[in-house]
């Protein structure tokens, strides 16, 4: 806290300009009017204040707006945004995408801070849903943003917003999140033709059910092994050797290198060894010839 002292003669600030960088902290406190600062916030970011001087400016704004800053001030906070606590930000009502972009720009290239997370939360809650423009903006600044949301939060993403999602935006998503996103993607891309559809849906396939994988296997999609390895184990297990061969196309040879990893390992255990041998890859661990396969899950469902 800067000690309250009278402003020296001739130093009262008439406007927010570069001369203020030469003011001590106590001079800024005494000589800069908070209302003047608020009306000329757009100038602050262009002036190379020290980190400590920015503390004083924040303190002045806090005194002027104890209930939270108006959006006209928030939009021009610039580096001052980095001084805001999540508690400060919870008082704000941010409705403009331009304001959101301006504040995200300040933090660009850095990890998502608690301040940014709170800001995004306030903004999205204010909008009621994650619309396409917002999602576009957020994933541009934070590719992992989508995967930071809970399945419940993801359920508010409209299918139209899925067009904004890039493959790298889903890199850190877990199966529960992809379970929510996949049906939305399927709906969003439903009018595309086979090969274009596969390119778009590929990143979301970690949430695909067995029947959709079976359908894809009939379309010559040549799924790569990296995508196959991200599929839900429970969705892969019921696929036949022939279906997996069709699904992977020329990439089927990659199964050998992955035979000890899920879902390939679990899938191998469910296949007849005879069928696996038809692939000519030397995959081992299938059900030996002459053994009967009982589907216990089916039995339980019937009883």
């Amino acid at each position: 806290e800067v000690e309250k002292t009278a402003c020296p003669s001739g130093k009262k600030a008439r406007e927010i300009d570069e001369s203020l960088i030469f003011y001590k902290k106590w001079e800024l406190e005494a000589c800069v009017d908070a209302a003047l600062l608020a009306t000329q916030m757009d100038r602050v970011n262009a002036i190379p204040f020290t980190y400590e001087q920015l503390d004083v400016l924040k303190h002045k704004l806090d005194e002027l707006y104890p209930q939270g800053y108006p959006e006209s001030v928030i939009q021009h906070l610039g580096y001052l945004f980095l001084k805001m606590s999540p508690e400060d930000i919870r008082k704000w009502n941010v409705t403009s995408l331009e304001t959101l972009k301006a504040l995200l720009e300040v933090n660009k290239g850095h990890e998502m801070s608690p301040q940014v997370a709170t800001l995004i939360d306030r903004f999205v809650k204010g909008r009621g849903q994650l619309d396409k423009d917002t999602l576009d903006t957020l994933t541009a600044f934070y590719p992992g943003y989508l995967c930071s949301l809970s399945p419940e939060e993801l359920s508010s993403v409209p299918p139209s917003s899925i067009w904004a999602v890039r493959p790298q935006d889903l890199d850190t998503c877990d199966p529960r999140q992809l379970d929510v996103l996949y049906p939305k993607a399927r709906l969003a891309f439903q009018n595309m033709n086979g090969s274009e559809y596969f390119v778009k849906i590929q990143s979301f396939l970690g949430g695909a059910p067995t029947e959709d994988l079976k359908a894809l296997s009939q379309q010559n999609v040549s799924m790569d092994l990296a995508t196959f390895m991200k599929l839900r184990t429970d969705a892969v297990l019921p696929l036949t050797v022939a279906e997996v061969q069709k699904l992977l196309g020329p990439h089927v040879e990659g199964l050998k290198a992955e035979e000890r990893h899920r879902p390939v390992r679990d899938w191998i255990l469910r296949q007849r060894q005879d069928d696996l041998d038809t692939l000519g890859l030397g995959l081992q661990g299938g059900i030996p010839n002459g053994y009967l396969v009982l589907d216990l899950s089916m039995q339980e469902a019937l009883s």
Epitope: P48, T50, Y51, Y79, H110
Partner: nanobody, 116 residues
Framework: QVQLVQSGGGLVHPGGSLRLSCAAS????????MRWYRQAPGKERDLVAL???????YYEDSVKGRFTITRDNPSNKVFLQMNSLKPEDTAVYYC???????????WGQGTQVTVS
């Protein structure tokens, strides 16, 4: 660790010139706003000159037209060229590296400039 090492101070007659140098190790100075401060005996430390990361410079009124702050990013150094020196320029001069993104800032060890 980060170090700012200053050199170039000394005793000079009024009207003379000196060039202060500030060499950094452990940080890339091109990412920082660089400042020169001075502190005369019994006085507060005052900002004299500043150069931003994009090369824009600012000067305190009493040194405008006499002092020039420059940076040489390849050598990771900042300089303060002081011409037409006056007795009132006598002080210990400090270089400082700071970024608005962080409360951490770095200081040189200080160098005495005496104009007499």
């Amino acid at each position: 660790q980060v170090q700012l090492v200053q050199s170039g101070g000394g005793l000079v007659h009024p009207g003379g010139s000196l060039r202060l140098s500030c060499a950094a190790s452990g940080i890339d100075l091109s990412l920082y706003r660089m400042r020169w401060y001075r502190q005369a005996p019994g006085k507060e430390r005052d900002l004299v000159a500043l150069i931003t990361d994009d090369g824009t410079s600012y000067y305190e009124d009493s040194v405008k037209g006499r002092f020039t702050i420059t940076r040489d990013n390849p050598s990771n150094k900042v300089f303060l060229q002081m011409n037409s020196l006056k007795p009132e320029d006598t002080a210990v001069y400090y270089c400082n590296a700071e970024t608005p993104l962080s409360p951490v800032n770095y200081w040189g060890q200080g160098t005495q400039v005496t104009v007499s």
